[in-house]
Interface confidence: medium
């Protein structure tokens, strides 16, 4: 398989609601019609798959119904959003892109986006 460059931001801070968004951009060497995007989380040298979607160029990304990810595509960019994050989910989130069809097959893996998640402070009790 052929290597392909994938770019993603180095650092992203999740919102107070536990939502983090980042762009994954790949340098497509050809006109792919079928693309697969996988988000991997690396923490303590362990790599786990967070979510994945296969899409046809020009169509929306479709993640599984119970996925914590959503996304949109525009050309060679994929806008990924991960929801429901908590402080314990802080880690390096790696974007993996595969150009599935037509052949040849290309594989690209980004350097990862460090997502920092800070659990919101509980609201203090109010007298009012």
């Amino acid at each position: 398989c052929k290597a392909m460059h994938v770019a993603q931001p180095a650092v992203v801070l999740a919102s107070s609601r536990g939502i983090a968004s980042f762009v994954c951009e790949y340098a497509s060497p050809g006109k792919a019609t079928e693309v697969r995007v996988t988000v991997l989380r690396q923490a303590d040298s362990q790599v786990t798959e967070v979510c994945a979607a296969t899409y046809m160029m020009g169509n929306e990304l479709t993640f599984l119904d119970d996925s914590i990810c959503t996304g949109t595509s525009s050309g060679n960019q994929v806008n990924l959003t991960i929801q429901g994050l908590r402080a314990m989910d802080t880690g390096l989130y790696i974007c993996k892109v595969e150009l599935m069809y037509p052949p040849p097959y290309y594989l690209g893996i980004g350097n990862g986006t460090q997502i920092y998640v800070i659990d919101p402070e509980p609201c203090p009790d109010s007298d009012f």
Epitope: G30, M100, Y101, P104, Y105
Partner: antibody
Framework: EVQLVESGGGLVQPGGSLRLSCAAS??????????VGWIRQAPGKGLEWVSA????????YYADSVKGRFTISRDNSKNTLYLQLNSLRAEDTAVYYC????????????WGQGTLVTVSS | DIQLTQSPSSLSASVGDRVTITCRAS??????LAWYQQKPGKAPKLLIY???TLQSGVPSRFSGSGSGTDFTLTISSLQPEDFATYYC?????????FGQGTKVEIK
């Protein structure tokens, strides 16, 4: 061990229909990283790619010669691949092979034994 | 569509001979070419992919080379079980097409 076993071939009249099956074992048809497809070989002739279906999704692809007449599908629960052949013509007479197509190589690494489809009146 | 032309269409050789089959693509396919062996009444068997990568379990007497439009399959020392028909197939764009085949017969 990877195995592919085709069935469903036979004699059919021009304009008729047939459904070919390919039972897979030793790997999952829905596994990412591999597609599966059909290749045919007319008697005494060479090989012709017919159709393929992706492993991750269910994206389908066809050769122009069969587009609109043939339909590829799979049943993940049965780990079986199908090819529905409609509006058959004499030139569709061939041995139909199902084969596995790893994306990393895009070459057919495992083949079934083939099933003969004869279109004749 | 990319056309693949194999030469020769057939050849006669003896056990122990060095055999070379060529495959020419109508346009460049980089190194995205595979070779198959087919014996009568049997399914094809993958020998080489990506022009020169030997498929697991295939004897080392088989080798492939080439890039762009011109490719070669070489059998360094022909064995009795090698008498068969050989096909090339590109994997660069679609449709995936095959060469017309080269039949290797016993001299």
């Amino acid at each position: 061990e990877v195995q592919l076993v085709e069935s469903g071939g036979g004699l059919v009249q021009p304009g008729g229909s047939l459904r070919l099956s390919c039972a897979a074992s030793g790997f999952s048809l829905s596994t990412g990283g591999v597609a599966v497809g059909w290749i045919r070989q007319a008697p005494g002739k060479g090989l012709e790619w017919v159709s393929a279906i992706s492993g991750y999704g269910s994206t389908t692809y066809y050769a122009d010669s069969v587009k609109g007449r043939f339909t590829i599908s799979r049943d993940n629960s049965k780990n079986t691949l199908y090819l529905q052949l409609n509006s058959l013509r004499a030139e569709d007479t061939a041995v139909y092979y199902c084969a596995r197509l790893p994306y990393s190589a895009y070459a057919f690494d495992y083949w079934g034994q083939g099933t003969l489809v004869t279109v004749s009146s | 569509d990319i056309q693949l032309t194999q030469s020769p269409s057939s050849l006669s050789a003896s056990v122990g001979d060095r055999v070379t089959i060529t495959c020419r693509a109508s346009q460049g396919v980089s190194s995205y070419l595979a070779w198959y062996q087919q014996k009568p009444g049997k399914a094809p068997k993958l020998l080489i992919y990506a022009a020169s990568t030997l498929q697991s379990g295939v004897p080392s007497r088989f080798s492939g080379s080439g890039s762009g439009t011109d490719f070669t399959l070489t059998i360094s020392s022909l064995q009795p079980e090698d008498f068969a028909t050989y096909y090339c197939q590109h994997h660069y764009g679609t449709p995936l097409t095959f060469g017309q085949g080269t039949k290797v017969e016993i001299k």
